[in-house]
Amino acid sequence: VKMAETCPIFYDVFFAVANGNELLLDLSLTKVNATEPERTAMKKIQDCYVENGLISRVLDGLVMTTISSSKDCMGEAVQNTVEDLKLNTLGREICPAVKRGVDLFLTGTPDEYVEQVAQYKALPVVLENARILKNCVDAKMTEEDKENALSLLDKIYTSPLC
Amino acid sequence: VKMAETCPIFYDVFFAVANGNELLLDLSLTKVNATEPERTAMKKIQDCYVENGLISRVLDGLVMTTISSSKDCMGEAVQNTVEDLKLNTLGREICPAVKRGVDLFLTGTPDEYVEQVAQYKALPVVLENARILKNCVDAKMTEEDKENALSLLDKIYTSPLC
């Protein structure tokens, strides 16, 4: 069986945000029927990556890749093996470890978020970058922005493109 | 079981190359005892990412994340489930789909490499970027450079840090 990638629209949105490319972000958000407030929230996160420069995008891309290819995520596939192999399919859901990281990025404290990142990538430069991004997001985003970002994530996770 | 990430040193090297950061690359290469010719080969690949600009780094990061989190890679974990679960461990090897992509990047034709990327990310802008990088690498690297890059990859895959 040629197995589909895991929730491609999530990674499209993540990389559009981290890249700082508004045109790519808008194109991705269009595909999940994002609202104007949801877009505003994502733009605020994107601003943090842009302000923090290239190194921020690369290091956070490294974190995302590391978590996505981690054995925590591999493990998710393993848990459902018996049922999945009977059906000869594997679900396309986003890995819970990735979901958890994104949730903490929005709703956790800086310490909680950095601690989660450290489980996967303990390089000091990576953790410092994670803290800078988290502090920036907390400074830029209102509670309403964060709720809008979470509602957009729900749309992404439940999208047919996921 | 808290499962370790898959071959972290590989992703450290990949992101250092794609980022264009020589200091990060040297730091990673030191950890796998890279020789001078192996380092030279990696620098040539790094030059291609730098010349092709930010969008190249981001798009190739997206490809790497997509393959690493694809169900082809998840599937690798699943194949060995019975044995692995008995031992309550999962191997830390790099996913064969990632390995295959890197091998084709070095030794395949541009068409073969782009075809492999297209299985995971068919966005035209991604495939165009993959072709540009591949053509650049073929133009910059001698056969000897490519052999050195492959020998470095063997060191990475067999490293205790993988």
């Epitope: 490319n21 045109l23 790519l24 808008d26 194109l27 029927n33 | 802008v125």
Partner: antibody, heavy 120, light 107 residues
Framework: EVQLVESGGGLAQPGGSLRLSCAAS????????MTWVRQAPGKGLDWVSA????????FSADSVKGRFTISRDNSKNTLYLQMDSLRAEDTALYYC?????????????WGQGTLVTVSS | DIQLTQSPSFLSASVGDRVTITCWAS??????LAWYQQKPGKAPKLLIY???TLQSGVPSRFSGSGSGTEFTLTISSLQPEDFATYYC?????????FGPGTKVDIK
Amino acid sequence: EVQLVESGGGLAQPGGSLRLSCAASGFTFNNYAMTWVRQAPGKGLDWVSAISDSGRSTFSADSVKGRFTISRDNSKNTLYLQMDSLRAEDTALYYCAKHRNWNYPVFDYWGQGTLVTVSS
Amino acid sequence: DIQLTQSPSFLSASVGDRVTITCWASQGISSYLAWYQQKPGKAPKLLIYSASTLQSGVPSRFSGSGSGTEFTLTISSLQPEDFATYYCQQLNSYPFTFGPGTKVDIK
């Protein structure tokens, strides 16, 4: 009433440069992404380049990448296309167009175009 | 890049005729397709976006359908002002590409 007026076209030598401008009025310019589209004489439409509402992000067709640069000045409600290393095949009528909105980037308003001729 | 092809490339019709133009995409583009009309010496005009949504001010005799790789533009009853060239455009991914056009002229 939305209006887009292009200027800056003319005759250029191969390898030469031109800078096109597009003056926008009748809408809140800094809320919309903008695009350049060209049309060679007697031919079809060819998308050239797009720029986001803030001007932070751009995308260009491979045929012009590294030679043409799209930019905007939101304080002047003006879109630009800097064309360098011009080639004969760049000869065309160049239109600027407004994106309908961020979540469906069709081009709902177009200028009347400015003609660029590249010839020695 | 995503390639678009249009059929027919040239079409002769009479006032009152029902006209159908087809656009094919080289890969699936969901409903991210638009149709434009262009008259000689004029800028293109947006007719339909999202494959089937009529742009405001466009007469209801124009309609669009399709999804994925095959799309159609239909003019239910051709009027004298409809003689023009029609282009499809994909907006699924950059670079945005146009079809080669279909010229509709008077039989």
